[in-house]
């Protein structure tokens, strides 16, 4: 039975040209996290973090995605095209798969706020 919940940074905004941290956190389960996959709204993969094999950043994002902090992802040099949904998929044993959603809005405005409160989607 899957007892865990994914907490995410929820809806966040960041400034064009800036950077943002995408974070998910799995709680309320003793399951072992074997892998975390980060994906964009169009199903393209940004990165994979495997517990043993480490990080793998995908070619389209090699220059502007940095692994971490932790199991999270730092997206740099933001463009307006980065606006949209991001998904973290936690592969765990023995529970199975958990998925969290973050919505990122990239703003032209110089007063873009980066809200980073954790919330359960």
């Amino acid at each position: 039975m899957m007892t865990g919940t994914i907490e995410t940074t929820g809806n966040i905004s960041a400034k064009k040209g800036g950077s943002v941290i995408l974070q998910c956190h799995l709680s309320s389960t003793m399951a072992q996290v074997t892998q975390v996959n980060w994906e964009q709204h169009d199903h393209s993969l940004l990165a994979i973090r495997n517990a043993e094999l480490g990080w793998h950043i995908y070619p389209a994002f090699k220059d502007r995605v940095a692994p971490g902090p932790g199991l999270g992802l730092t997206l740099q040099s933001l463009t307006m095209n980065d606006t949209g949904e991001y998904f973290c998929t936690y592969h765990t044993y023995p529970d199975g798969t958990y998925r969290g959603r973050i919505f990122l809005e990239v703003l032209e405005s110089s007063v873009a706020e980066h809200s980073a409160r954790f919330q359960i989607p």
Epitope: N37, E39, S44, E52, L53, G54, Y58, H91
Partner: antibody
């Protein structure tokens, strides 16, 4: 030039063990994961497991966890795979390959298990 | 484990033809898919990674597309040297798994 040079063919008896090697060159050893793949009957490909030379992490396909053991010698940029309790089902060609998508492959090591 | 199904075991084609080889994943694999070519007596060779990126030195007649569960590999104009077995592989989650292969042959 990236190269993965594997050890030669092996003929072993059922129940025995064998250790095959894959010596790498032409790139920074710790920068890429290394994997082992089994090809049976010249067709079916199966991922056995992978090794991260950077952190020493090893990830096995559950199917091969008892059968295979992956080790490394950083001083010679070589990875090894030991196969235990061999049977005719283990007769196959075994390849080492680099990276998550296997961008470079060894030439293959043919293992024949026969009495 | 994720099952990668290549429905066509053998595809017959003529030189110069356009060929699509399909691979269906039993679960979502996003774009974590590679395509390999294996000629008789040789090791597999990476052609496409991350579903649509050509590996170094691979001719541009080879392309890959798709994501999720439906992945396609295309040869725009088949040449003699393309007659081989083609395998898809997912590395979205371990254990990484391969399709059963599609053999490309001349009619």
């Amino acid at each position: 030039e990236v190269q993965l040079q594997q050890s030669g063919p092996e003929l072993v008896k059922p129940g025995a063990s064998v250790k095959i090697s894959c010596k790498t060159s032409g790139y920074t050893f710790s920068d890429y994961t290394l994997h082992w793949v089994k090809q049976s009957h010249g067709k079916n490909l199966e991922w056995i497991g992978g090794f991260n030379p950077n952190n020493g992490g090893t990830n096995y396909n559950q199917k091969f966890k008892v059968k295979a053991s992956l080790t490394i010698d950083k001083s010679s940029n070589t990875v090894y795979m030991e196969l235990r309790s061999l049977s005719s089902e283990d007769s196959a060609v075994y390849y080492c390959a680099r990276n998550w998508a296997f961008d470079y492959w060894g030439q293959g090591t043919t293992l024949t298990v026969s009495s | 484990d994720i099952v990668m199904t290549q429905s066509h075991k053998i595809m017959s084609t003529s030189l110069g033809d356009r060929v699509n080889i399909t691979c269906k994943a039993s679960q979502h694999v996003s774009t974590a898919v590679a395509w390999y070519q294996q000629r008789p007596g040789q090791s597999p060779r990476l052609l496409i990674y991350s579903a649509s990126y050509r590996h170094t030195g691979v001719p541009d007649r080879f392309t890959g597309s798709g994501s999720g569960t439906d992945i396609t590999f295309t040869i725009s104009s088949v040449q003699t040297e393309d007659l081989a077995v083609y395998y898809c592989q997912q590395y979205y989650t371990t254990p990484w798994t391969f399709g059963g292969g599609t053999k490309l042959e001349i009619k």
